[in-house]
């Protein structure tokens, strides 16, 4: 699987999950989240050659098409597969609230 | 929706489904499919700015991150959303077989 266990410990050039730290204020302009100040969101990056963790029959077709037509702009793209929630603290008035923001952290990628 | 109805009739620059015809022999090297000789597979292409048909909370975060950090390589990608099957005819010996190949045609796209 193109997950953090594999991707963070390798020098994989193809589609893989990469490390990305996002600071809520600096990178998003969000001041409403009190904690955490930022988080390891990660992101997906890398080419999607034929047979590399392809998502659907269409992805396989498109990767093969791209192999036969190297100059084409049609190619599969490396995108998130497994996402995890992030617990946050924000304030309603003076009262702190804890909430889980769903689908915030990328754990693995796929070629779609 | 970023579907064929909207995208094929507009000059949309952002993520949208684009026309792509794939010839099984020429583009994939497949000789086993007897009919059709090719099909309109389509593909997804275009930038994914903030709020443009974003798939998950993570996609929104990444698009906003990209807006604040324009030079970053982390950005959402335009990928298939709705896929449709393609009926094909192939031969087993001298006997023609009809089969539906699932997830072969892109009908709409999303930013993931």
């Amino acid at each position: 699987a193109l997950d953090t266990n594999y991707c963070f410990s390798s020098t994989e050039k193809n589609c893989c999950v990469r490390q990305l730290y996002i600071d809520f204020r600096k990178d998003l302009g969000w001041k409403w989240i009190h904690e955490p100040k930022g988080y390891h969101a990660n992101f997906c990056l890398g080419p999607c050659p034929y047979i590399w963790s392809l998502d659907t029959q269409y992805s396989k077709v498109l990767a093969l098409y791209n192999q036969h037509n190297p100059g084409a702009s049609a190619a599969p793209c490396c995108v998130p597969q497994a996402l995890e929630p992030l617990p946050i603290v924000y304030y309603v008035g003076r009262k702190p609230k804890v909430e889980q923001l769903s689908n915030m952290i990328v754990r693995s990628c796929k070629c779609s | 929706a970023l579907d064929t109805n909207y995208c094929f009739s507009s000059t949309e620059k952002n993520c949208c489904v684009r026309q792509l015809y794939i010839d099984f022999r020429k583009d994939l090297g497949w000789k086993w499919i007897h009919e059709p000789k090719g099909y309109h597979a389509n593909f997804c292409l275009g930038p994914c700015p903030y709020i443009w048909s974003l798939d998950t909370q993570y996609s929104k975060v990444l698009a906003l991150y990209n807006q604040h950090n324009p030079g970053a390589s982390a950005a959402p990608c335009c990928v298939p959303q709705a896929l449709e099957p393609l009926p094909i005819v192939y031969y087993v010996g001298r006997k023609p077989k009809v089969e539906q190949l699932s997830n072969m045609i892109v009908r709409s796209c999303k930013c993931s």
């Epitope: 730290y21 600071d23 204020r25 600096k26 904690e35 955490p36 100040k37 930022g38 617990p87 702190p96 | -």
Partner: antibody, heavy 117, light 107 residues
Framework: QVQLQQSGAELVKPGASVKISCKAS????????MNWVKQRPGKGLEWIGQ????????NYNGKFKGKATLTADKSSSTAYMQLSSLTSEDSAVYFC??????????WGQGTTLTVSS | DIQMTQSPASLSVSVGETVTITCRAS??????LAWYQQKQGKSPQLLVY???NLADGVPSRFSGSGSGTQYSLKINSLQSEDFGSYYC?????????FGGGTKLEIK
């Protein structure tokens, strides 16, 4: 590399005020929270508060509200902490520390404050 | 405010031994916890952040674990340079309180 250089030791009289500085270098000062921490001789660490230099936002430990005032000067990449109405209880070492990734990853060398008549 | 209860307060051990220091939070802090080492007269040094991640340059004999309200710092095969004081600190809503500290002494 990241460095936090604090001002020198201070000897002040009870009732007076003092302003401690922390000059940052090696990172984007404006976009990282700066924390301040107190340590009395032979004791543990106490979190005083934090400031976001980019817009001057602050969060204080309730215990230090009215005692400590945090400010920052973006042009010189310097954070300040003013302590007022000093008593012997304020005699301590004060640290500035950069907030990053759910921790304080870089600390200043500490400023010793002695309050004595 | 979230309280951090650190134990033991002091520990007398020999070089080569393994020690575990624990920190209990008064409520769930979702792994937003750091561990520091402080030598006499020096600034604290970050060892572990986000409960389990080793800070740059920290030897692999140090490890952090835990979740929810219970966290621990383990030091395998103690070296002479490991003696000093250790503190945990939560980062789950201000004030970011510290544990009371653990003084690690040579036996």
């Amino acid at each position: 590399q990241v460095q936090l250089q604090q001002s020198g030791a201070e000897l002040v009289k009870p009732g007076a005020s003092v302003k401690i500085s922390c000059k940052a270098s090696g990172y984007a000062f404006s976009s990282s929270w700066m924390n301040w921490v107190k340590q009395r001789p032979g004791k543990g660490l106490e979190w005083i508060g934090q400031i976001y230099p980019g817009d001057g936002d602050t969060n204080y430990n309730g215990k230090f509200k009215g005692k400590a005032t945090l400010t920052a000067d973006k042009s010189s990449s310097t954070a300040y902490m003013q302590l007022s109405s000093l008593t012997s209880e304020d005699s301590a070492v004060y640290f500035c520390a950069r907030h990053y990734d759910g921790s304080t990853d870089y600390w200043g060398q500490g400023t010793t404050l002695t309050v004595s008549s | 405010d979230i309280q951090m209860t650190q134990s033991p307060a002091s520990l007398s051990v020999s070089v080569g031994e393994t020690v575990t220091i624990t920190c209990r939070a008064s409520e769930n802090i979702y792994s937003n916890l750091a561990w520091y080492q402080q030598k006499q007269g020096k600034s604290p040094q970050l060892l572990v952040y986000a409960a389990t991640n080793l800070a740059d340059g920290v030897p692999s004999r140090f490890s952090g674990s835990g979740s929810g309200t219970q966290y621990s710092l383990k030091i395998n095969s103690l070296q002479s340079e490991d003696f000093g004081s250790y503190y945990c600190q939560h980062f789950w809503g201000t004030p970011y309180t510290f544990g009371g500290g653990t003084k690690l002494e040579i036996k």
